[in-house]
């Protein structure tokens, strides 16, 4: 990664794992203070590729609850409300960082973990494979 | 939250902020080993609400690079390639965790931060406000 100039006011670390084990303050700073909470809440229902949200809960993880999107249909919803199977509803996935308690049940020791979550669905034109 | 049963093998913490300041191992464990990374890579182009990905880089953040989706059109793309402005392309947003160096430039001290990122776009029916 980028070499960060060391600040003389930094916490010291003589840890043999330095800098792979770091101190993290869990008092979360939220950068979304200006966000309108009504903004994207009902897209799951109004989308042409609507989805439901399913709970994935794990007390050994931070955050402990993650919501996974599952597309309601294989196809996409047309203006008349019927499903068009010539198009496909597909999940949009994102890799996110979570903290995993390690060792298990330890309240103050974690390991970073990457997990893939489905955030919502989008309607795509299918890839048609032509047989020669 | 729920009191996690303390494991006797846990690292000790006499920090006055305990348990809000924790140790985190940055050797990331990746749970997505079976995922095909190319699987959803072309949805941005094939979607009826296509998007472009813009790089957001910040050396004081971990991960330092985040990709933000921006919808290409206000409307949605029809089968003939034209844009239907009776429908709306909207970003699907996800709240994610990142680590922010705190104090700045410190290599081994971070604060958790929640940020809202746009992951992709979906096509929605607009909300029509009827004037009385």
């Amino acid at each position: 990664g980028i070499a960060i100039p060391r600040n003389s006011g930094c916490p010291n670390s003589e840890d043999k794992n330095f800098p792979r084990t770091v101190m993290v303050n869990l008092n979360i700073h939220n950068r979304n203070t200006s966000t309108n909470p009504k903004r994207s809440s009902d897209y799951y229902n109004r989308s042409t590729s609507p989805w439901n949200l399913h709970r994935n809960e794990d007390p050994e993880r931070y955050p402990s609850v993650i919501w996974e999107a599952k597309c309601r249909h294989l196809g996409c919803v047309k203006a008349d409300g019927n499903v068009d199977y010539h198009m496909n509803s597909v999940p949009i996935q994102q890799e996110i960082l979570v903290l995993r308690r390690e060792p298990r049940h330890c309240p103050n020791s974690f390991r970073l973990e990457k997990i893939l979550v489905s955030v919502g669905c989008t309607c795509v034109t299918p890839i048609v494979h032509h047989v020669a | 939250g729920i009191a996690i049963p303390r494991n006797s093998g846990c690292p000790n913490s006499e920090d006055k902020n305990f348990p809000r300041t924790v140790m985190v191992n940055l050797n990331i464990h990746n749970r997505n080993t079976s995922t095909n990374p190319k699987r959803s890579s072309d949805y941005y182009n094939r979607s009826t609400s296509p998007w472009n990905l813009h790089r957001n880089e910040d050396p004081e953040r971990y991960p330092s690079v985040i990709w933000e989706a921006k919808c290409r059109h206000l409307g949605c793309v029809k089968a003939d390639g034209n844009v239907d402005y009776h429908m709306n392309s909207v970003p699907i947003q996800q709240e994610i965790l990142v680590l922010r160096r705190e104090p700045r430039h410190c290599p081994n001290s971070f604060r958790l931060e929640k940020i809202l990122v746009s992951v992709g776009c979906t096509c929605v029916t607009p909300i029509v406000h009827h004037v009385a």
């Epitope: 979360i28 966000t35 439901n52 709970r55 931070y62 402990s64 609850v65 | 939250g1 709240e95």
Partner: antibody, heavy 122, light 108 residues
């Protein structure tokens, strides 16, 4: 000890507005999703609004969509429900409840407030 | 939306009896099911979560079981303070969370 205390209920005329508040203590409020659930006299339980920990996402059932707005102030450990265009069928005891998000919980709605009564009548 | 069908709607029993209340979901809810107890004029109180996990402080005579679509709450030996209304809640799929219609447990 986790505590949730609602306030702001009362008698209001149809078409009127009311703002409910819920003061939270005993847990890291900003780590939890919060909900409002209501119970009409002699009836069952119905959720009316939910807001994620950071406040960036909120959801409503069709019965209140466009009339009710949930919000939160994490600095004040407070949850709110702004209710506009009230109808007789909104008469109920309104409870605030907690759900897991960053912090873990005993499932959804593990802790509830004592409730505040909203009566919509002319 | 997932529908929750709770039965029976009312039940008469005596102190010391073993009683079982059931909830059926319209689809698999992956054991994301809670049970609540509500007494008149009071807020609901959480008893069981994740289908079979007892909330701290809840007496061990309460137990939950089930998976997939079918779940039950059992009180092994009824005590006078157990007469109340019981609700199940699915919290797997959202929105919305859905409650059962309630079971009123009365003294015979």
């Amino acid at each position: 000890e986790v505590q949730l205390v609602e306030s702001g209920g009362g008698l209001v005329q149809p078409g009127g507005s009311l703002r409910l508040s819920c003061a939270a203590s005993g847990f890291t409020f900003s780590d939890y999703t919060m909900l409002w659930v209501r119970q009409a006299p002699g009836k069952g339980l119905e959720w009316v609004a939910i807001i994620k920990s950071g406040g960036s996402y909120s959801y409503y059932p069709d019965s209140v969509k466009g009339r009710f707005t949930i919000s939160r102030d994490n600095a004040k450990n407070s949850l709110y429900l702004q209710m506009n265009s009230l109808r007789a069928e909104d008469t109920a005891v309104y409870y605030c409840a907690r759900d897991g998000d960053y912090g873990s919980s005993y499932g959804a709605m593990d802790y509830w407030g004592q409730g505040t009564l909203v009566t919509v009548s002319s | 939306d997932i529908q929750m069908t709770q039965s029976p709607s009312s039940l008469s029993a005596s102190v010391g009896d073993r009683v079982t209340i059931t909830c059926r979901a319209s689809q698999d809810i992956n054991s994301y099911l809670s049970w609540f107890q509500q007494k008149p004029g009071k807020a609901p109180k959480s008893l069981i979560y994740r289908a079979n996990r007892l909330v701290d402080g809840v007496p061990s005579r309460f137990s939950g079981s089930g998976s997939g679509q079918d779940y039950s709450l059992t009180i092994s030996s009824l005590q006078p303070e157990d007469f109340a209304t019981y609700y199940c809640l699915q919290y797997d799929a959202f929105p919305p969370y859905t409650f059962g219609q309630g079971t009123k447990l009365e003294i015979k």
